[in-house]
């Protein structure tokens, strides 16, 4: 007969390690007992447990509550044990010694490695603003044993660079994602993906990009100049811009205060029934935390079209 085992066993920190030891023998052979020990530098070998075919499992005091048999059904030739709640101090070599009848004794050694899975963290970079050059969007750090893999998953065009720092039996990996900010990136997800053999699946942390920008301002409402005549009701000028954060709007008149009855409502300037006093240069001011923009238009209110003598055919925008 022979022992079926594994010379390398890997377990995740905090989980149960199965230390395999199965005797593959002839049908008439029996396993009397299996002795488990840890190969210890000071004491040679330190007993963990004794599995007896008749008397069952006896665990040494040092490993009380930490060693058990795998759940049933159990094969009488299977001397495997579970080491519960593995910690890094459990790393090392273990030995199973199988006493069989009539074939005698067999022994096998295996190495236990304990994986420490990472707990990744994502840190956004400084505020992103359109017009900046290559800028740090986010960094992602993960430390584990062995070294984790840190990558980025995104539709956004950018460059990733990583650095790692090794400690004994573990490594901290930091990956940075740099990009040239543009408004099209607003609201786009940037996902840090961390892989490690101690994780059942990749860990993903998503950061939503926010790029500050302010578009050029323009004014709508003067497209048909002939509509701007004395007596017209419901005339409005609308200031067009967009930004992140959303901009605030303000209206002024270049050559004096806004005429009475002219109302500012957000991005829109509303006029009462038009008179020639409403002619003038109007300025739309747009601003957010990033920047400010302005656009001005010249309004000329035409005389009553029913009075040809007073008609002025001039409306201009600049």
């Amino acid at each position: 007969g022979e022992l079926e085992t594994s010379d390398l066993v890997t377990v995740v920190l905090g989980q149960d390690a199965k230390l395999p030891c199965f005797y593959r023998g002839d049908p008439d052979e029996q396993v009397g007992q299996v002795a488990w020990a840890r190969v210890d530098p000071n004491e040679g070998t330190r007993e963990l447990a004794l599995l007896h075919s008749k008397y069952g499992l006896h665990v040494s005091p040092a490993y009380e509550d930490r060693v058990e048999q795998p759940p049933p059904p159990r094969d009488p030739l299977d001397g495997s044990i579970l080491l519960r709640n593995a910690v890094q101090a459990d790393e090392g070599e273990y030995e199973c010694r199988v006493s069989t009848f009539p074939a005698g004794s067999f022994q096998a050694r295996m190495r236990l490695r304990v994986l420490v899975p990472p707990l990744p963290s994502l840190n956004p970079g400084p505020p992103l603003e359109e017009g900046q050059g290559l800028t740090l969007a986010a960094s992602c750090t993960a430390e584990g044993s062995p070294a984790p893999s840190v990558t980025w998953d995104t539709e956004v065009k950018g460059t990733q660079s990583s650095r790692s720092f090794k400690h004994s039996r573990s490594a901290a990996v930091t990956s940075e994602f740099h990009l040239v900010p543009s408004r099209s990136m607003n609201g786009q997800p940037l996902t840090c993906v961390v892989s490690h053999p101690g994780l059942l699946q990749d860990q993903r942390i998503t950061h939503t990009l926010q790029v500050a920008f302010l578009a050029e301002a323009s004014v709508r409402g003067l497209e048909d100049q002939n509509l701007w005549h004395v007596g017209r009701e419901g005339a409005t000028l609308k200031c067009l811009s967009e930004g992140q954060p959303p901009p605030k709007y303000n209206w002024t008149r270049l050559d004096g205060p806004l005429p009475s009855g002219v109302r500012v409502k957000g991005d829109t300037l509303g006029f009462p029934p038009l008179t020639t006093e409403h002619s003038g240069v109007y300025v739309c001011h747009v601003s957010n935390e990033l920047s400010s923009r302005a656009s001005q238009v010249t309004v000329e209110v035409l005389a009553d079209p029913e009075d040809p003598g007073k008609q002025v055919d001039l409306v201009s925008a600049s």
Partner: antibody, heavy 116, light 108 residues
């Protein structure tokens, strides 16, 4: 700084044994496994096995079972690899390497020539 | 055992060019368990990349590693004269530890 310094080149006759040493410095010797890797002339790297300097536990590649013995002396931070019943195809450079999952530091290598 | 197959066997390039070396594994290997080494004539191997993509201490950033599962790549941007050597990949996730057969990077 971390260093692994190996013993000098040796010439052996077929059937003899060779023992190569690997002295570690610059770190805690018992804190890292030591592996042995060999490289025949013009060939690639071949893993032979490891020793845990802390426990003295070993694991050998199947190919070398029964012919290789790895030992250590913690008092002088030195690991040893002994290969017996030498054949001409054991002519190679033998390296020791420190394991930190990967092999982050290597000895300079020891050329063992097996020739009658 | 896990078999690592490197390609090409030999790569002839000029300084300043980019080298792309491949390592395929016969079974899936966690990226945390894959390393790349550089070896120059008469010298010991030197760790370049560990965990598939992490540069070892003092390795220039023109060296980068990537890949997962069974396909891994070592890329060397802007080749320098000192980069011409033999490169090995290695898996250390299961026993026995295994190496690829190597890729020789030579000057064209």
């Amino acid at each position: 700084q971390v260093q692994l310094v190996q013993s000098g080149a040796q010439v052996k006759k077929p059937g003899a044994s060779v023992k190569v040493s690997c002295k570690a410095s610059g770190y805690t010797f018992t804190g890292y496994y030591i592996h042995w890797v060999r490289q025949a002339p013009g060939q690639g790297l071949e893993w032979m096995g490891w020793i845990n300097p802390n426990s003295g536990g070993t694991n050998y590649a199947q190919k070398f079972q029964g012919r290789v013995t790895m030992t250590r002396d913690t008092s002088i931070s030195t690991a040893y690899m002994e290969l017996s019943r030498l054949r001409s195809d054991d002519t190679a450079v033998y390296f020791c390497a420190r394991e930190d999952w990967d092999f982050d530091y290597w000895g300079q290598g020891t050329l063992v020539t097996v020739s009658s | 055992e896990i078999v690592l197959t490197q390609s090409p066997g030999t790569l002839s390039l000029s300084p300043g060019e980019r080298a792309t070396l491949s390592c395929r594994t016969s079974q899936s290997v966690s990226s945390s368990y894959l390393a790349w080494y550089q070896q120059k004539p008469g010298q010991a191997p030197r760790l370049l990349i560990y965990g598939a993509s992490n540069r070892a201490t003092d390795i220039p950033d023109r060296f980068s590693g990537s890949g997962s599962g069974t396909d891994f790549t070592l890329t060397i941007n802007r080749l320098e004269p000192e980069d011409f050597a033999v490169y090995y990949c290695q898996q250390y996730g299961s026993s026995p530890i295994t190496f690829g057969q190597g890729t020789r990077l030579e000057i064209k």
